[in-house]
């Protein structure tokens, strides 16, 4: 077609709007162009979800969304002759997809996953309220680097929570972390309503604890040097350094955002090492140090999950009580 049609002319509706699910949580709508569209119309398609969210005007006859299918989702599509949002589109055609059947009270709850040290993902959930105590759960997962949906094999229990962990290693591909892992939990017998979740790979990351390499005194300052967990670069981490003094029974916690080893007292050029100087520490008393780390918002969406504490390291001498 040529230029845009007169703005008053409304195009016919799109045809054959259909919806399907790929992987676990990729919902795809496709449609055909309207029948009898104006010959001088360069067709564009206006679409939005049922709650008027995510309006889009594009020439493609498809639209997809990654969404946990725990509730019904609808897409409305219309055709128009320009990219102008103020142009009135054709009558909107709607197509919805509903979650799998089942009693909502049977579905698992609190389904969430943590990516441990960018090397394995551990998901956990609570059983549904209307389920048999002998329900056997299965977790399925999919992400872009997998060719097909995988079943998680390592189901475990922690108190009332069920869980499963699977290997998920950070790929060098720069776009890997821009994607998500799609998760579904259901039971083997098909009696419960399946539950879905989407875990962005830039959130819910829990690093391993760091490893303290060296403690040393210079005047009344304590120099702490540690090795960061594998798979993380130091600029993507924040740190918490805790120092306990046995004599004064003080407990100091330092929140460290940058931990460069620029001081001459620090061992230089050690890869993936961070450093911090604790001021005003008494060298003739016993000082015990431990460190934990978390991802920061420079590199990740989430900055709430601290690693476990490192192993403690002590320096100085314990005074004899007289």
């Amino acid at each position: 077609g040529g230029g845009g049609a007169a703005p008053t002319e409304t195009q016919p509706p799109v045809t054959n709007l259909s919806v399907s699910v790929e992987n676990l949580c990729t919902v795809i709508w496709t449609w055909n162009p309207p029948e009898g569209a104006s010959s001088n119309c360069s067709l564009w398609y206006f679409s939005h979800f049922g709650d008027k969210q995510d309006k889009k005007i594009a020439p493609e006859t498809r639209r997809s969304i990654e969404v946990p299918l725990n509730e019904r989702i609808c897409l409305q599509v219309g055709s128009q002759c320009s990219t102008n949002e103020s142009e009135k589109p054709s009558i909107l055609v709607e197509k919805c997809i509903s979650p799998p059947e089942g009693d909502p009270e049977s579905a698992v709850t609190e389904l969430q996953c943590i990516w441990h040290n960018l090397s394995y993902m551990k998901c956990s959930w609570l059983p549904g309220r209307n389920t048999s105590p002998d329900t056997n759960y299965t977790l399925y997962y999919w992400h872009r680097s997998l060719e097909k949906i995988h079943q998680c094999e390592n189901i475990f229990r922690e108190g009332q929570y069920f869980g499963c962990s699977f290997d998920l290693t950070k790929v060098k591909d720069s776009s890997f972390e821009q994607h998500s892992v799609q998760i579904m939990v259901k039971d083997n017998a098909g009696k419960i309503k399946p539950s879905f979740n989407i875990v962005p790979l830039t959130s819910r990351v829990k690093p391993d604890p760091p490893h303290i390499k060296n403690l040393s005194f210079h005047n009344d300052d304590l120099y702490v040097q540690w090795e960061n967990p594998q798979n993380f670069i130091s600029r993507c981490l924040f740190y918490e350094v805790e120092v306990n003094n046995s004599q004064t029974e003080t407990h100091n916690v330092f929140y460290v955002q940058e931990a460069k080893c620029e001081n001459p007292e620090f061992e230089r050029n050690v890869e993936n090492t961070s450093c911090f100087m604790v001021p005003g520490v008494l060298p003739d008393t016993l000082n015990t140090v431990r460190i934990r780390v978390k991802t920061n918002k420079l590199c990740y969406e989430d900055d709430k999950l601290w690693s476990n504490w490192s192993q403690e390291m002590s320096i100085g001498k314990k005074r004899n009580s007289t």
Epitope: L126, S132, Q160, Y161
Partner: antibody, heavy 118, light 107 residues
């Protein structure tokens, strides 16, 4: 040994407030839901409220909804029940219980008496 | 809401007798029914979970049976220390509900 111990009960006037605490020990607290159950003098047991191990799921009996708030502090192994707008019919022994498995109560505290009276 | 009806409300029995307490649910609850014992001035204690599974440390004279809507707690060869109130509880959905209780008196 797995234990739960309630505190904070007492005499309060109608319309008043009270905060009950339940301190737990002997188990990984964040892996288990905790529940409050009450028993009016000479009466049977009545479920009041439940909070899941990580605190994401919270449930109340209709009789206390909007007046009572359950919460937990997993770093202190403690669950709380904040009771506002108290009524005479809230007078009861309040028990804290640890949930296990598919929602049964395997460990109960001794209870704390709440009396609402003018 | 699941309504649980226990019978009898009260029973006076002699030691060594066999006692049966029934609990009927207003709708099917599978095996999501649990039995508790409450002695005077004490907190409740779990006896039976999931309708028929004995809780650890509970004497073997206590047993449970049933599924769906009809459940039974049986005490074989009653002992004096079994004088208590007995409650059934449903954990099928919310709210959790208890039966009205059965008070057991030893003659």
């Amino acid at each position: 040994e797995v234990q739960v111990l309630e505190s904070g009960g007492g005499l309060v006037q109608p319309g008043g407030s009270l905060r009950l605490s339940c301190a737990a020990s002997g188990f990984t607290f964040s892996n288990y839901a905790m529940t409050w159950v009450r028993q009016a003098p000479g009466k049977g047991l009545e479920w009041v409220s439940t909070i899941s191990g990580r605190g994401y799921s919270i449930y109340y009996a209709d009789s206390v909804k909007g007046r009572f708030t359950i919460s937990r502090d997993n770093s202190k192994n403690t669950v709380y029940l904040q009771m506002n707008s108290l009524r005479a019919e809230d007078t009861a022994v309040y028990y804290c219980a640890k949930e296990e498995g598919h929602w049964y109560f395997d460990v109960w505290g001794r209870g704390t008496l709440v009396t609402v009276s003018s | 809401e699941i309504v649980l009806t226990q019978s009898p409300d009260f029973q006076s029995v002699t030691p060594k007798e066999k006692v049966t307490i029934t609990c009927r649910a207003s709708q099917s609850i599978g095996s999501s029914l649990h039995w508790y014992q409450q002695k005077p001035d004490q907190s409740p204690k779990l006896l039976i979970k999931y309708a028929s599974q004995s809780f650890s440390g509970v004497p073997s004279r206590f047993s449970g049976s049933g599924s769906g809507t009809d459940f039974t707690l049986t005490i074989n060869s009653l002992e004096a220390e079994d004088a208590a109130a007995y409650y059934c509880m449903s954990s099928w959905g919310l709210p959790y509900t208890f039966g009205q209780g059965t008070k057991l008196e030893i003659k």
